[in-house]
Amino acid sequence: LECYSCVQKADDGCSPHRMKTVKCGPGVDVCTEAVGAVETIHGQFSVAVRGCGSGIPGKNDRGLDLHGLLAFFQLQQCSEDRCNAKLNLTLRGLNPAGNESAYEPNGAECYSCVGLSREKCQGSMPPVVNCYNASGRVYKGCFDGNVTLTAANVTVSLPVRGCVQDETCTRDGVTGPGFTLSGSCCQGPRCNADLRNKTYFSPRIPPLVLLPPPTTAAPSTRAQNSSSTTSTAAPTTTTSIIKPTTAQASHTSPHEMDLEVIQEEGASLSGGAAGHGGTAGHGGAAGHQDRSNMEKYPGKGGAQIPAKGGS
C-alpha cells in the first residue's frame, strides 16, 4: 500500500507542494489522515497527519468545546493507494480578518498562542490579547494547555493559550480518537504564562486535610486503575451530528459542542488536477487566522469550525 505522508503543525507541512508518498510496511492496509483544528476568540489553527495507519477504513468527525475553546477533529482511513488526501486542511480565509475593534474588551488580558511553536509560546514571550465577550458568552479567564494529535504512528502537539469562559478549571480536557485538547484556566491579568503545575486547590475551596490512618489493622482494598487506550482507528462512518449551542461549559465535565457537520467529498484524485475549477484544497494550512467574522459552516469537508463571535 502507498500513502501520502506529511505532518502539519500550524504551518504548511501538509500543503500541496510538500506532499510526499510512502510505501507502507507489511500488514498495513489503511492510509490515514487526521486533522484537528482549534479556535480561540483570537484565531484558529490546525494540526494534521497523513501516513500509513492501522485499523479499519471509515470516518470520524467530532466537534468539541472546552470552556469556549472550540475544537474540530476529523479522521479518515481508507484502503486504496494514496487515498488519504480527502480532508481539506486549509483554514477558511476571513473577510475581513482581524476585525477585533468591533468587540468591547471586558478587562481580562491573557497570553495568546494560536499556531505558535512551543519555543515561541514560552512564559511571557507570546503576544498579549484583550479578552471580549462573544455570542452571549463571557470570556474572562485565561487558558494554558496543549492540543495533541496522534495518527499514523506520529504525535503532533502544539501549545494553546487564550481567553476562555472558565477562570478556575484545572487539567480539563476534551478528546476524540487520537485527539486531545487539554489544559488549565486561571483568573487575573496574564495569569496563563505557565499553568502546567496548577493543582486542584482553589482560593474558594479549602485544602483537603489528610487524617492519620486508624491504629487498628484492617484488610486493605486496592483500587483498580482502569487504563483506557485511545485507538486512532475510526469506526466505519461514524459522524457526530451536532449543532451549535450557547450553553456554558460545565466546570466538571467539558462536553461535546453541538456542531452540524456538513461534508462533501473532495475532488477525486484521479480526476482533473484541479477538481472542478476550484483549488483542490487538499492540504495546506494558512498559518493561523483571526476568527472575528468567520464563515459559519465548513465547505468541502473542511476542518473549519463555526465561529462564536462574528457579525
Epitope: 510538500r18 484541479a274 483549488t279 487566522q289
Partner: antibody, heavy 117, light 112 residues
Framework: EVQLLESGGGLVQPGGSLRLSCAAS????????MSWVRQAPGKGLEWVSY????????YYADSVKGRFTISRDNSKNTLYLQMNSLRAEDTAVYYC??????????WGQGTLVTVTS | QSVLTQPPSASGTPGQRVTISCTGS?????????VHWYQQLPGTAPKLLIY???KRPSGVPDRFSGSKSGTSASLAISGLRSEDEADYYC???????????FGGGTKLTVLG
C-alpha cells in the same frame, strides 16, 4: 473557467523596480496557494516564490530573496510581485501559477520583464 | 545547473515510444516528494501534463504516463505524434532549498 492574467512587465534599468500583478478569476482565489515562476529567454523554468492562501506563509528562491516580495489581495483576487534592485539576470517572462493537487495546474500567459541599461 | 537533471533533448518518429528521465537527490525526489511534469509548446505557457508522479489531469491523453522510483522519475510518451513536439519539464519540492525545483527541460523532436 480558470483564468490568470499577468501585467506590469516592461523595460527597466538595473537597480530599478517593477510591480507585477496577476488577476485571477474562475475559482476561489482566497483558498488557493499561488506562485510566480519565470523563464529567461531560451532557458528553462525557474520557480520564484510561493504564497499561502491567507498570505501568512511565504517562500522565495535564493536568487530573489531580499529583493522580491510576493503578496496578495484576496478581496481583489489579485497576486503581486514587487521586484526591487533588478539585475540583468532577472530578465524573463514571469508567469503566475495556481497550485492545485500538488502541482501548478493553471498558468497565466506571462509578462515579459527586461532589465537592461 | 538545475537541481533536477533531464536530458537536454530527445527524439522519435511518429508512433514510437519515447521516455524522458528526471534525476533528483535525497532532498527532493528521494525524500518522497511527488513529481510533476509540464509540457510547453513553442510560444505558449507551460501546461500540467502529469501530477502526483503518475496521474493525468482531465484532457491529457493516456499516451502520456509517469513513474517514479528512488531518486528519479520518468515520463513516457507512446504513439508519438507531431503535436507532441515541445519542451518537457519535471518538478518537485526540495527540502534543502525550501522551494520548488524544476528540471532543465527536455526538447522533444518528432522526426519525419
Amino acid at each position: 473557467e480558470v483564468q490568470l492574467l499577468e501585467s506590469g512587465g516592461g523595460l527597466v534599468q538595473p537597480g530599478g523596480s517593477l510591480r507585477l500583478s496577476c488577476a485571477a478569476s474562475g475559482f476561489t482565489f482566497s483558498n488557493a496557494w499561488m506562485s510566480w515562476v519565470r523563464q529567461a529567454p531560451g532557458k528553462g523554468l525557474e520557480w520564484v516564490s510561493y504564497i499561502s492562501s491567507s498570505g501568512s506563509t511565504i517562500y522565495y528562491a535564493d536568487s530573489v530573496k531580499g529583493r522580491f516580495t510576493i503578496s496578495r489581495d484576496n478581496s481583489k483576487n489579485t497576486l503581486y510581485l514587487q521586484m526591487n534592485s533588478l539585475r540583468a539576470e532577472d530578465t524573463a517572462v514571469y508567469y503566475c501559477a495556481r497550485e492545485g493537487l500538488w502541482a501548478f495546474d493553471y498558468w497565466g500567459q506571462g509578462t515579459l520583464v527586461t532589465v537592461t541599461s | 545547473q538545475s537541481v533536477l537533471t533531464q536530458p537536454p533533448s530527445a527524439s522519435g518518429t511518429p508512433g514510437q515510444r519515447v521516455t524522458i528521465s528526471c534525476t533528483g537527490s535525497s532532498s527532493n525526489i528521494g525524500a518522497g516528494y511527488v513529481v510533476h511534469w509540464y509540457q510547453q509548446l513553442p510560444g505558449t505557457a507551460p501546461k500540467l501534463l502529469i501530477y502526483d508522479n503518475n496521474k493525468r489531469p482531465s484532457g491529457v491523453p493516456d499516451r502520456f504516463s509517469g513513474s517514479k522510483s528512488g531518486t528519479s522519475a520518468s515520463l513516457a510518451i507512446s504513439g508519438l505524434r507531431s503535436e507532441d513536439e515541445a519542451d518537457y519539464y519535471c518538478a518537485a519540492w526540495d527540502d534543502r532549498l525550501n522551494g520548488a525545483v524544476f528540471g532543465g527541460g527536455t526538447k522533444l523532436t518528432v522526426l519525419g
